[in-house]
């Protein structure tokens, strides 16, 4: 999905007001120097395509984040303000929650949260120059 | 089962403000969009926003931005549509209808009975 | 952004199929496959018959059905009966801002 035409600033907005302290929750008891960031976004349509990406994509170590509820908010948040959104990615998501049996916080995990705040939080200062 | 009660008759002057209840019930109220759709008398119906409890969030039509207002109380599942300014075009059936599951929320699969609100001096 | 067209009214006699258009743009219809049908009798809320573009929901008779050619979708009822005397909405979403609009509506007359 190309994520050119979303509304910024309203994805923003329901980040700050909740998607963000759900993240931290998560991440509660874990020290924010724990682990080092390794992915990178550059602009915000790149940022939601990672975003998107470690959130919903199994991984090795992580099976599914899809049921957590900043990943619920966030597929909620990219529906409505991502103009055509592909509902067989939306489905996709539906599919992945089902097969997920029980609630396992890996440090894999983890670490794939931790990287995702800090999208994130690039996805919050666009204008920022790339490190 | 599922369904969606909605406040009851208004009558109200140009100028007024009005606000219509929407009572969620049978279904988890979290998993879905609320929207508020109007309409005229002998015309179409014209979505006016919507309320997403699981992100906090509204959306409203351009045409509304500014004089329609969409809270919710989760605690008893009521969603409410306050619409300010109120002049004669505004007298309408208006709907409270629950957007489709799985943040499909561009359909509406249950629909409230409707409210009629008459604008009249 | 203006409501799709649908036409005013349309007719048929019991048994017969007949097949509503909406015609929209290539910023609603014509660019995402979120095409619902409502039908609604009078003094009634709204029903769903049909969700992006060609779904049912259940309980919905297999009598109705949906399709989608660039910017227009199509309702088509086949054997028809008195019972689906009633008015017709298409819906699409339209983006971000408007995000939902409904077709001007449909007449249906069973003669």
């Known amino acids: 999905y190309d994520f050119t035409n979303c509304d910024f600033e309203k994805i923003k907005a329901a980040y700050l007001s909740t998607i963000s302290k759900d993240l931290i929750t998560y991440m509660s008891g874990t020290k924010s120097t724990e682990f080092n960031n390794t992915v990178s976004c550059s602009n915000r349509p790149h940022c939601l395509t990672e975003i998107q990406s470690l959130t919903f994509n199994p991984t090795a170590g992580c099976a599914s984040l899809a049921k957590e509820m900043f990943a619920m908010k966030t597929k909620a948040a990219l529906a409505i303000w991502c103009p055509g959104y592909s509902e067989t990615q939306i489905n996709a998501t539906q599919a992945m929650k089902k097969r997920r049996k029980r609630k396992v916080t890996t440090n894999k995990c983890l670490e794939q949260v931790s990287q995702l705040q800090g999208l994130w939080r690039r996805f919050n200062r666009p204008l920022l120059k790339q490190q | 089962q599922e369904q969606l009660v909605q406040s009851g008759d208004e009558v109200k002057k140009p100028g007024a403000s009005v606000k219509v209840s929407c009572k969620s019930s049978g279904f988890t109220f979290g998993s879905y969009a609320i929207s508020w759709v109007r309409q005229a008398p002998g015309q179409g119906l014209e979505w006016m926003g919507m309320?997403?409890?699981?992100?906090?969030?509204?959306n409203y039509a351009e045409k509304f931005q500014g004089r329609v207002t969409i809270t919710a109380d989760p605690s008893t599942t009521t969603t409410s549509m306050e619409l300010s300014s109120l002049r004669s075009e505004d007298t309408a059936v208006y709907y409270c209808a629950r957007g489709g599951s799985n943040y499909l929320y561009w359909y509406f699969d249950l629909w409230g009975p409707g409210t009629p609100i008459t604008v009249s001096s | 952004q203006s409501a799709p067209i649908q036409p005013r009214s349309v007719s048929g006699s019991p048994g017969q199929s007949v097949t509503i258009s909406c015609t929209g743009t290539?910023?609603?219809?014509?660019?995402?496959?979120?095409i619902s049908w409502y039908q609604q009798h009078p003094g009634k809320a709204p029903k769903l018959m049909i969700y992006d573009v060609s779904k049912r929901p259940s309980g919905v008779s297999d009598r109705f059905s949906g399709s989608k050619s660039g910017n227009t979708a199509s309702l088509t009822i086949s054997g028809l009966q008195a019972e689906d005397e009633a008015d017709y909405y298409c819906s699409s979403y339209a983006g971000t801002d408007t995000f939902v609009l409904f077709g001007g509506g449909t007449q249906l007359t069973i003669v």
């Open positions: 290539s910023s609603d219809i014509g660019g995402y496959n979120r």
């Open positions: 309320l997403v409890p699981l992100l906090g969030v509204t």
